[in-house]
């Protein structure tokens, strides 16, 4: 069999949902010493990078100028050692945001329930979309998804206060094109058994995933570069839509 | 932002060389990436060649590749495309697209990376 190198790992730095005309940047993290990174869009080759080599690194940025619903979709990269290619990454959905509307979120019977009441998220966009989809604030890649003509319900069932935070929703023209975020929507969700009025909410800070690990190489580094770099690949969880 | 002029165009037979050339505006030409597209009556526009803002990234496309060579030179704001062995296939309106990546390494082989694209100058190649 053809030999390859680990394949690398694409996150999208800061958040994979990004707003029209605003920059994205993707990492490709792959090993050091790689001559060459290239990023592929929908299967064709997008953008090349060949770092130079007093500047080792173990991964590059792409820049994404001026985001819109053309550049939205699935990307992937590889990357060169020599004339060795490494497997293609996984695949990253990069989704454009602040199309068109905004839709309105609210919540049944209220933003105060007690644990193990049901509640139930509707999302309204009067604009003609099909797909709602409802995100967790510091959960942005746990996304449900429901469909409805103006109108999308999200049934939570019996919440615990792990169900507490801040909801937005979005209606989605397609599976990368979303509206603008509706105003957001936090959860309170009391009366646990035993006492949870001081248990932390859920962080709003971005998904860890979605933060781009550079490293510079030290000779430690590059002794254990490809060895940390398959473990990172078989640790790694990525998701698909 | 910055504006882009193609010049340098025209008509050459087939086998014959020409060299085209993308003025840019503005005092800031260094930290664009530059890039060649050409479209041909009733196709799409396609990659021919790009520049990285150091100009050590050069990237082609395989059907100029040999053939082409782009350069750019920082103190004047331009960047060129040397054309040799021209074929007929080779005629088409040539762009100039720039775009500003962070990297100074990085080239865009796709339409939709560039930012910035100039109107274009008529290469004709005649058999």
């Known amino acids: 069999p053809k030999q390859t190198l680990p394949k690398p790992i694409i996150r999208a730095e800061s958040t994979y949902m990004v707003p029209k005309e605003k920059q994205a940047t993707l990492c490709c993290q792959g090993s050091y010493g790689a001559v060459e990174y290239q990023l592929h869009f929908e299967g064709s080759l997008f953008a090349v990078e060949r770092p130079k080599p007093p500047e080792r690194i173990n991964g590059v940025k792409f820049h994404i100028p001026d985001m819109n619903s053309r550049k939205a979709g699935r990307y992937s990269c590889i990357y060169r050692v020599g004339e060795l290619w490494s497997e293609r990454s996984d695949l990253l959905d990069l989704v454009v945001t602040e199309m068109y509307d905004t839709p309105t979120l609210s919540v049944h019977p209220g933003p105060e329930v007690t644990s193990g009441e049901k509640v139930t998220f509707y999302c309204r966009l009067d604009t003609a979309t099909s797909m709602f989809l409802l995100l967790k604030e510091g959960r942005s890649r746990d996304v449900q998804r429901s469909y409805g003509k103006v109108q999308a319900e999200f049934p939570m069932g019996p919440v615990t206060t792990a169900h507490r935070g801040s909801y937005r929703c979005f209606g989605s023209y397609n599976n990368y094109a979303w509206s603008f975020p509706s105003e957001p929507v936090k959860l309170l969700v009391t009366g646990d058994i035993e006492n949870t009025s001081l248990a932390p909410t859920d962080p709003t800070f971005p998904d860890s995933w979605d933060t781009c690990l550079l490293t510079r190489e030290t000779g430690l580094q590059k002794d254990l570069a490809l060895w940390d770099h398959t473990a990172q690949n078989h640790h790694h969880h990525h998701h698909h839509h | 932002q910055v504006q882009l002029v193609e010049s340098g165009g025209g008509l050459v037979q087939a086998g014959d060389s020409l060299r085209v050339s993308c003025a840019a505006s503005?005092?800031?030409?260094?930290?664009?990436?530059m890039g060649w597209f050409r479209q041909a009556p009733g196709k799409e526009r396609e990659f021919v060649a790009a520049?990285?803002?150091?100009?050590?990234?050069?990237y082609y496309a395989d059907s100029v590749k040999g053939r082409f060579t782009i350069s750019r030179d920082n103190a004047k704001n331009t960047v060129y495309l040397q054309m040799n062995s021209l074929k007929p296939e080779d005629t088409a309106v040539y762009y100039c697209a720039a775009s500003r990546p962070l990297s100074t390494t990085q080239v865009g082989i796709a339409s939709a990376w560039y930012e910035y694209w100039g109107q274009g100058t008529q290469v004709t190649v005649s058999s």
């Open positions: 503005g005092r800031t030409f260094s930290t664009y990436a």
């Open positions: 520049s990285s803002r150091d100009g050590t990234t050069t």
